[in-house]
Every structure is written in C-alpha cells, then in structure tokens.
C-alpha cells in the first residue's frame, strides 16, 4: 500500500448489507485489503475481503444476515476499518465510526410493471426491495424515460417527494417504443444517496386509432 | 455555518498539563472526524491527533504518543485535548479542525479536513 489519495465511502441498504468501496491511487492491483466491522451494541464482528472492481478502487459487502432482517437500528454505530497487508502485518488505512442511518443506499427498485398502457400515456408501478420499515413512508423517488434517439443523460428526471410506488407517463408518443427507469431515496441520514436505477422496463404505446383523433 | 472555537490554551511549565477545548456549531458534531494540529513558530502546520465521530478510534503523532489523550463530547458538540507532561517543543498554536466526512486515513492524517478554527497559543517555558 502506498500514500496515495485514498477514499473510503460505505452504505447501509437499511437492512442486512453494508457495501463499501476502498480507492487509492497508485496502489497496487494485488494489494491484499479486507474492512472490518465491530459494532458497538453487537455481538457479531464482520470481515469482508476488498475485490478489485476498477484499477485503483476495490469493492466489498458486509452481509449481516437475511436480506430482509433488521440486523442495525438508527442508535447503531459500526466502526469500519480498511486494513491492508503490509508484509507480515495490517495497517489501518481508513476508519470511520458510520451510523448505518446516516449513510443510507437502499436497493434499485424492483418489479417494474405496466399496469396500463395506451396511445399517449403509459402506467407503470414498482416495488421497493429490503428497505426498513423504520421508513414508514418517508421516502422519494426519482423517474425517466428514455425516448426514441436519446441517452438515459438527457433524459428529464420526474420526481415523486412521497412513497408513491407508480407514475402515470403523459404526453407519448404513439406506437412509440420507451423505456423507463426509477429510483429511490429515504428522506433520512446527512450521507444518504439515491440507490442504483432499477433495471429499464420496455414498454410500447398503443398506434393511434386509423382516422380518429386520439 | 460550521464553527470551531478553541479555547484552554496559555503558558505553563515544563512537566506540566493543559486542557485544550474545541466548541463546534452549524453542524451534525458527531457525524465527522476531528483533529488537533499545530504550528510552531516559524514551521508549517504539524498533525497531532485525530478522532472518529463518536471517539472509538483515535490516533497520535508519534511525538505526542503516551502524553496527549484526544477526545469528544457529542452532547456538548465538544472536542478535547489532554496534554500531559509538556516539552518546550509543544510550544505552538493549536487548532481544532474537522475533516470532510466521517472517515480518517492515518496514514495521511493530514488529508481531508475542510474547516479550521482560529487557535489557541500554548506556551511552554520555565
């Protein structure tokens, strides 16, 4: 390991999994790196080995238990530790005392669906996954759908400031085929991001009706 | 906006002990890393110890190792530097800083503060 930029930056998903990423510049592909987790209400210790993800960062998921238990509360703190081999020994590269409820990324939304789909509109619903009950309904979501000769980038972002699990598309295109992405984000936690977008759902409209204005 | 008031410094023998205090506002105290750093007369700012946010972890130049205890109060939004058996060379103005998240690197402790406060001088001399 070497003395190059580093960051550390992890995630709590509200349930069951802390994803955290190691980055140095300059430091070796091979280098050997694990975080270590040690709660300060908790039984468990938790170790997970940092897998090269890019050339110079590193990726790990602390697993606690069952995606859906509750294993962290909003009182937890978990220190996490990036440690790196140096010869017969680990150094301690990063630390953080991380409140899982301060550093909040839930899971991409799932279970994209068409409900209803016409001509000039399009409803589509989703569920959350592995998202805390803790939440209750203080979460907002993020939309867009990607046109015809347009990229995800340009695409304008619809956003939904309650738990509001589908979004009604106006103003398509007939016969027009698009695809739609969302996302999710508690309204809690300073460090709190937006989770990944799901995965697109496809969808076409219906063709305009042959002589009638639609 | 983020705040950071020193306070504790002044003139003391050799052998003595100081408390220095570092009272923070305008934001969330215990969701960031602090440090102490010094400037001696006439040298650059010089790291001496630094703190997770809520003091499970703590680090030490190797200068003040064994003599200077770093710790925090999150309830008093407050940040502690107990220095014992002082040396002339502890001569210098301290200052409370805070890092931009909540994560520190000891190998390059230095890395990463966003706001410091104004200082306190400590004198050390007979």
């Known amino acids: 390991a070497v003395n190059g930029t580093s960051q550390f930056t992890c995630f709590y998903n509200s349930r069951a999994n802390i994803s955290c990423v190691w980055s140095q510049d300059g430091a070796l592909q091979d280098t050997s790196c694990q975080v270590h987790a040690w709660p300060d209400r908790r039984r468990w210790n938790q170790t997970c080995e940092l897998l090269p993800v890019s050339q110079a960062s590193w990726a790990c998921n602390l697993i606690l238990g069952a995606p859906d238990s509750q294993k962290l509360t909003t009182v937890d703190i978990v220190t996490l530790r990036v440690l790196c081999r140096e010869g017969v020994r680990w150094r301690v590269m990063a630390i953080q005392d991380f409140k899982p409820f301060e550093n909040l990324r839930l899971m991409a939304p799932i279970s994209l669906q068409v409900v209803h789909v016409e001509t000039h509109r399009c409803n589509i619903s989703w569920e959350i996954s592995q998202a805390s009950h803790y939440f209750e309904r203080h979460l907002e979501f993020e939309a867009r759908t990607l046109s015809p000769g347009h990229t995800w980038e340009e695409a304008p972002l619809l956003t939904l400031k309650q738990k509001q699990e589908w979004i009604c598309l106006e103003t398509l295109t007939p016969d027009t085929q698009y695809e739609f992405q969302v996302r999710v984000k508690p309204l809690q936690g300073e460090f709190t991001t937006w989770s990944p977008w799901s995965q697109p759902l496809a969808f076409r409209t219906k063709p305009a009706a042959l002589g009638k204005d639609t | 906006q983020v705040q950071l008031v020193e306070s504790g410094g002044g003139l003391v023998q050799p052998g003595g002990s100081l408390e220095l205090s570092c009272a923070a506002s305008g934001f969330t105290f215990s969701n960031y890393a602090m440090s102490w750093v010094r400037q001696a007369p006439g040298k650059g700012l010089e790291w001496v110890s630094s703190i997770t946010g809520f003091g499970r972890g703590t680090d030490y130049a190797d200068s003040v190792k064994g003599r200077f205890t770093i710790s925090r109060d999150n309830d008093k939004n407050t940040l502690y530097l107990q220095m014992n058996s002082l040396k002339p060379e502890d001569t210098a103005v301290y200052y409370c800083?805070?890092?931009?998240?909540?994560?520190?690197?000891?190998?390059?402790?230095?890395?990463?503060?966003?706001?410091r406060g104004q200082g306190t001088q400590v004198t050390v001399s007979s």
């Open positions: 800083a805070r890092y931009s998240s909540s994560t520190y690197y000891p190998p390059t402790p230095a890395r990463g503060r966003d706001y």
